[in-house]
Amino acid sequence: PRSIEVKYIGVKSAYVSYDAEKRTIYLNITNTLNITNNNYYSVEVENITAQVQFSKTVIGKARLNNITNIGPLDMKQIDYTVPTVIAEEMSYMYDFCTLLSIKVHNIVLMMQVTVTTAYFGHSEQISQERYQYVDCGRNTTYQLAQSEYLNVLQPQQ
């Protein structure tokens, strides 16, 4: 079998809302993945599991099941959204994210994603990790090139 390549492209959008009473930030982060099937047979993408960390704390998790089928020598782009919550012991970040004097409230988040693929009854897991800047102060839609530019760490090979 030839390789199945997973490339984390970056953050596509981040939609923010606040709970003033709880001093909590809610960030819905949509990410983009490219999955390439270099084989001469179809491959099933069984699931994608993702998690987001801020300051070594997991702030959001997501799992997508029965996603798609990728044909021979084909590539598919998949978007997935991770709902994240910055609260409790990290509520000090609420001060930063809601401060009007700052116009771009960039925070560094660790994006982790694992793609499980299956073909002929065989499963394979491919993982990626990437640090990304995300603006916690306003709704943001990123250009994919811009998202690449925002990366501080290249994905693990």
Partner: antibody, heavy 119, light 111 residues
Amino acid sequence: EVQLVESGGDLVKPGGSLRLSCAASGFTFSGYGMSWIRQTPDKRLEWVATISSGGRYTVYPDSVKGRFTMSRDNVKNTLYLQMSSLKSEDTALYYCARDNFYSYAMDYWGLGTSVTVSA
Amino acid sequence: DIVMTQAAFSNPVTLGTSASISCRSSKSLLHSNGITYLFWYLQKPGQSPQLLIYQMSNLASGVPDRFSSSGSGTDFTLRISRVEAEDVGVYYCAQNLELWTFGGGTKLEIK
């Protein structure tokens, strides 16, 4: 209903000190940044200070930096402005206002408290 | 500091007609994030300032849609489509791209 009520304004001599207070009600005070703005006798508006929701960050213009200190008590729902080394140009009506993180504006203002610096 | 410039008085307007108030900033208020950090406040006689417009063109809560605002990065106009007696007061433009600064205010004059 959002309400902001300033107090503490007075007549003070140059070089003197004064502490203004702003009592907030009608919203979750600890969830919002707050600002002080003053209106001079010629009706010009000048931003004086901003404090973040939890009091972690304060920002001042150069005109008051080192002389004014903004603070807050989120238990008492009260905002403060400690003013020292007062000058005649500090004479103004002082307003407190709520910072809105969605509009990026100061969306509610109090009625103000008057500070006069004169010998 | 960014300087905000306004005329002290508007051209006198008749009730029911439209009015325009202008404001100019010494630097573009358009941030690279696409937001223009320009605001309009109205101070009615004996009252504190009230927010009318935020981020150049958005109407604040409770503000009648007779009010509208437009502009480029440095030149801005507040329009009142049908002036009412309650619109009388001083209109201030303000920016917070780089900390807050206000214009000197424009007094709306009624004929």
